[in-house]
């Protein structure tokens, strides 16, 4: 029976470890600055890195600019978006800006898109200063189903800070759905 | 066999509980206001509480102003930094401020420092108002190896809000590395 | 013994699954805009949804405007608070605003309230712009005991954005207390 108990312990340890790893999808995606859209209106950001620098993904999929859920669960979602402008980049079309981020969920089964989180600020970036900067952070806990897609929309994408420490979003699974 | 099953269950419950607790390092460090550097340039903040008020640490180490990772894993890192100024504190040298935070990772094996997250804003804190306040929040999910160190850099440290609910940073382990 | 092992495995799987789900309380509460207080002073927000749209709760209780902890543990707490003003809403009493959030913990055993996290900004919302917006995000890792209550206080509640993606707070349990 001792040998049997050891076998049970061993198989259980394997199962626990394996199931724990399988049960915890995550992603941390950083902005791909080579393909940032221009304009000041709200646009969906489709170019993100998933496998270089701080960017990584496991048990989730990145496709067509969207983070796709492969496993039902409750996830913590977050986004950090930085905007900046230096006078050497040229004059702003307007000094009154609306700098916003929207974290949206799209369901393929029911083709609809819903905003999970939003954040931002209106700013007056006057010519009295040569440099302007502003960051937004949002985060929240959401139920996600396999096949659902997370995407990021921002206003004024041409003002985005292209650094990997500045503009990113991510998710990690916290628990199963009952 | 029933007794044996109970023994298996009991030992497993202990093992599961024990391994779960051991597998989840965390820290929440709050600013130690007795030792905030002066100056307006970017500086590393080295004085943090780890065992009073809301501050706490487990299975991580705080040493020389840095949060040291003792256990490989994927961690959620976060920081909340508040800046404030009241006219009774004196005159600002400039009303145009860059209020920033940088969460950095240092690896001892390869002596290099990299910024994981940044946030902040440029601000115009005019003399027309007697009080000014601004907070930054950043958060993200990162792979950390044992021995790596997390530290916080800010600009204008003399403007930091010294309250434990205002200026803090932390980490908690979410999952093992595959 | 094989049958016994299968039984052990089966019972363990049930136990592991059950204990895992039971061990992970969470809540994501969204603002109930039908009952937002007026005024510019700091007030406690007591009307939140817990079971519609993105709002949800499990193994925690929402009562009398407070999120009640039912299970000891270390929790990640977060809040996202959005303020907005459009000129069509009328003139602001003052253009100099202090837009703040305070996440507080109340213990019934020791009737006292303490601020866990705060964030916000002073803003100058001038009449030169027809629309103003600002969001705050805070988050942190805290030890919570059964019976303790989490509540949200804000300044200028009449400026709150009533959307579920804008103004919300939440918590999820990360680990047990040793």
């Amino acid at each position: 029976i001792r040998a049997e108990k050891a076998m049970v312990d061993g198989s259980w340890l394997d199962l626990a470890k394996r199931s724990k790893l399988e049960a915890q999808p995550f992603a941390h995606l950083t902005i791909n600055a080579t393909d940032i859209p221009s304009g000041s209106h709200k646009v969906s950001l489709s170019s993100w890195y998933h496998d270089r620098g701080w960017a990584k993904i496991s048990n989730m999929t990145f496709s067509n600019g969207k983070l796709i859920v492969n496993q039902d669960g409750f996830y913590y979602l977050y986004a950090n978006i930085c905007f900046r402008h230096h006078e050497t980049s040229g004059d702003l079309a307007t000094e009154y800006l609306q700098l916003m981020v929207y974290v949206t969920k799209t369901s393929i089964k029911i083709p609809s898109s819903h905003t999970l989180m939003k954040g931002g600020s209106t700013k007056y970036w006057s010519g009295n200063s040569e440099f302007h900067f502003y960051s937004i952070n949002v985060g929240g806990f959401f139920k996600l189903r396999s096949g659902e897609e997370i995407s990021i929309e921002v206003s004024n994408p041409s003002l985005l800070d292209p650094d990997q420490d500045a503009t990113y979003f991510g998710a990690f699974k916290v628990r199963d759905i009952d | 066999i029933r007794a044996e099953k109970a023994m298996v269950d009991g030992s497993w419950l202990d093992l599961a509980k024990r391994s779960k607790l051991e597998a989840q390092p965390f820290a929440h460090l709050t600013i130690n206001a007795t030792d905030i550097p002066s100056g307006s340039h970017k500086v590393s903040l080295s004085s943090w509480y780890h065992d009073r008020g809301w501050a706490k640490i487990s299975n991580m180490t705080f040493s020389n102003g840095k949060l040291i990772v003792n256990q490989d894993g994927f961690y959620y890192l976060y920081a909340n930094i508040c800046f404030r100024h009241h006219e009774t504190s004196g005159d600002l040298a400039t009303e145009y401020l860059q209020l920033m935070v940088y969460v950095t990772k240092t690896s001892i094996k390869i002596p290099s420092s990299h910024t994981l997250m940044k946030g902040g804003s440029t601000k115009y804190w005019s003399g027309n108002s007697e009080f000014h306040f601004y907070s930054i929040n950043v958060g993200g999910f990162f792979k950390l190896r044992s021995g790596e160190e997390i530290s916080i850099e800010v600009s204008n440290p003399s403007l930091l809000d010294p309250d434990q609910d205002a200026t803090y940073f932390g980490a908690f382990k979410v999952r093992d590395i595959d | 013994i094989r049958a016994e092992k299968a039984m052990v495995d089966g019972s363990w799987l049930d136990l592991a699954k059950r204990s895992k789900l039971e061990a992970q309380p969470f809540a994501h509460l969204t603002i109930n805009a039908t009952d937002i207080p007026s005024g510019s002073h700091k007030v406690s927000l007591s009307s939140w949804y817990h079971d519609r749209g993105w709002a949800k709760i499990s193994n925690m209780t929402f009562s009398n405007g407070k999120l009640i902890v039912n299970q000891d543990g270390f929790y990640y707490l977060y809040a996202n608070i959005c303020f907005r003003h459009h000129e069509t809403s009328g003139d602001l009493a003052t253009e100099y605003l202090q837009l703040m959030v305070y996440v507080t913990k109340t213990s019934i055993k020791i009737p006292s309230s303490h601020t866990l996290m705060k964030g916000g900004s002073t803003k100058y919302w001038s009449g030169n712009s027809e629309f103003h917006f600002y969001s705050i995000n805070v988050g942190g890792f805290f030890k919570l005991r059964s019976g303790e209550e989490i509540s949200i206080e804000v300044s200028n509640p009449s400026l709150l954005d009533p959307d579920q993606d804008a103004t919300y707070f939440g918590a999820f349990k990360v680990r047990d207390i040793d």
């Epitope: - | 002066s38 340039h41 504190s89 004196g90 145009y96 860059q98 440290p157 | -």
Partner: nanobody
Framework: EVQLVESGGGLVQPGGSLRLSCAAS????????MGWFRQAPGKGREFVGF????????YYADSVKGRFTISRDNAQNPVYLQMNSLRPEDTAVYYC????????????????????WGQGTLVTVSS
């Protein structure tokens, strides 16, 4: 890295005027408070004047008060030192520097309170 470049120096007769400028380049947020200093041949570095980031407040050494004026463009760069009624004792290399503190301290006239020094520009007052 921040770089400061002073210009506008030269030879001028006593009673004459010169306008020095200090331009910042590199990774800078040039709305910082700035100071002007000078170093005469064989002497230590001497405080000349100080201007806040907004330009709203200026301080001067007693030796130049009423003759020198520090200003800055509304749109940040550069910072100017207008020198009138120049005297032979004003002969020196003039430097600009970035004030390192967030608050104006009583020690604003000490060179240790500044960093990112420029290379300097020589002003010679002689007939």
């Amino acid at each position: 890295e921040v770089q400061l470049v002073e210009s506008g120096g030269g030879l001028v007769q006593p009673g004459g005027s010169l306008r020095l400028s200090c331009a910042a380049s590199g990774r800078t947020f040039s709305r910082s408070a700035m100071g002007w200093f000078r170093q005469a041949p064989g002497k230590g570095r001497e405080f000349v004047g100080f201007i806040t980031g907004s330009g709203g407040t200026t301080y001067y050494a007693d030796s130049v008060k009423g003759r020198f004026t520090i200003s800055r463009d509304n749109a940040q760069n550069p910072v100017y030192l207008q020198m009138n009624s120049l005297r032979p004792e004003d002969t020196a290399v003039y430097y600009c520097a970035v004030y390192r503190r967030t608050y104006i301290s009583s020690t604003y006239s000490e060179s240790s309170e500044y960093d990112y020094w420029g290379q300097g520009t020589l002003v010679t007052v002689s007939s």
